[in-house]
């Protein structure tokens, strides 16, 4: 996480700051939805455990043409040590459960707040 930068300040960003910035962006996209987020697109649900940043990115990267989550996708890529491309899936996906992007983001936000409160920045 030493290379996380470019979100709100130049240069490397401490993990706690990077997580806060991700939380703030998720808060922003959950607050400002007058219409269904990403036109109600569905994504694979994930297990919110170790490796969830990559899993979350793998789910969200399959949503195309949705500018509202582009910043979130970029932020998540900073937390994921490997390159993620569309169609890629890890064992963390609950492959039989698809949920709306809006619900996915709300669930992810809730979990990230919990991690932040517990000091789990990595």
């Amino acid at each position: 996480l030493t290379c996380l930068g470019g979100f709100a300040s130049p240069g490397p960003v401490p993990p706690s700051t990077a997580l806060r910035e991700l939380i703030e962006e998720l808060v922003n996209i959950t607050q400002n939805q007058k219409a269904p987020l990403c036109n109600g697109s569905m994504v694979w649900s994930i297990n919110l455990t170790a490796g969830m940043y990559c899993a979350a990115l793998e789910s969200l990267i399959n949503v195309s043409g949705c500018s509202a989550i582009e910043k979130t996708q970029r932020m998540l890529s900073g937390f994921c040590p490997h390159k993620v491309s569309a169609g890629q899936f890890s064992s963390l996906h609950v492959r039989d459960t698809k949920i709306e992007v809006a619900q996915f983001v709300k669930d992810l936000l809730l979990h990230l707040k919990k991690l932040f409160r517990e000091g789990q920045f990595n």
């Epitope: 709100a8 300040s9 806060r20 910035e21 703030e24 808060v27 922003n28 959950t30 932040f116 409160r117």
Partner: antibody, heavy 119, light 107 residues
Framework: EVQLVESGGGLVKPGGSLRLSCAAS????????MHWVRQAPGKGLEWVSS????????YYADSVRGRFTISRDNAKNSLYLQMNSLRAEDTAVFYC????????????WGQGTTVTVSS | DIQMTQSPSSLSASVGDRVTITCRAS??????LGWYQQKPGKAPKRLIY???SLQSGVPSRFSGSGSGTEFTLTISSLQPEDFAIYYC?????????FGQGTKVEIK
């Protein structure tokens, strides 16, 4: 001691402008999201606006959107509320408040500054 | 917007009484709720955060419970300094919204 001190309130005519300030001390101001909350005479509390720690995200109540502008200067440990096109119904005590670092709502409040809009 | 309906709007109680105030949210807000006490001419003071966690320095006679849409603030044994107005605040979704307030008066 953690402290928030508002200033800038006063009497203004309808359609006029006013700029409120909030001076923060006793904590690292740049780490916290900040909010304005108001209370009309004899009424309850109304959330007005918020600004994130880095000024990236800003939110307003519908009742003030387009008329009020929230801003901050982290170098000066200060929060501001520029209020334009003021109406009689904006008459209230305006409180500056700090959002809990861990996203648990508002944990520290200033003493408030009174804004009176009257001709 | 999320509406917060607080009840009762006022109540009369005696020192030593157990007092309960309720807040209902118009939609699920999980635990994103705080309780605040305000005395005349003073700023609000947070008593409870995360629906049920006691703010540091607040007497243990204050407690909060609930999750989702229904929340309760309880004062187990009312003290003279507790006569004030109490508000709930949801911070789950912007615009943040307060309950209308409950005035706790001396019987």
């Amino acid at each position: 001691e953690v402290q928030l001190v508002e200033s800038g309130g006063g009497l203004v005519k309808p359609g006029g402008s006013l700029r409120l300030s909030c001076a923060a001390s006793g904590f690292t101001f740049s780490d916290y999201n900040m909010h304005w909350v108001r209370q009309a005479p004899g009424k309850g509390l109304e959330w007005v606006s918020s600004i994130s720690y880095s000024s990236t995200y800003i939110y307003y109540a519908d009742s003030v959107r387009g008329r009020f502008t929230i801003s901050r200067d982290n170098a000066k440990n200060s929060l501001y509320l520029q209020m334009n096109s003021l109406r009689a119904e904006d008459t209230a005590v305006f409180y500056c408040a700090r959002e809990d670092y861990y996203y648990y709502g508002l944990d520290v409040w200033g003493q408030g500054t009174t804004v009176t809009v009257s001709s | 917007d999320i509406q917060m309906t607080q009840s009762p709007s006022s109540l009369s109680a005696s020192v030593g009484d157990r007092v309960t105030i309720t807040c209902r949210a118009s939609q699920d807000i999980r635990n994103d709720l705080g309780w605040y006490q305000q005395k005349p001419g003073k700023a609000p003071k947070r008593l409870i955060y995360d629906a049920s966690s006691l703010q540091s320095g607040v007497p243990s006679r204050f407690s909060g419970s609930g999750s989702g849409t229904e929340f309760t603030l309880t004062i187990s044994s009312l003290q003279p300094e507790d006569f004030a107005i109490y508000y709930c605040l949801q911070h789950n979704s912007y615009p943040w919204t307060f309950g209308q307030g409950t005035k706790v008066e001396i019987k």
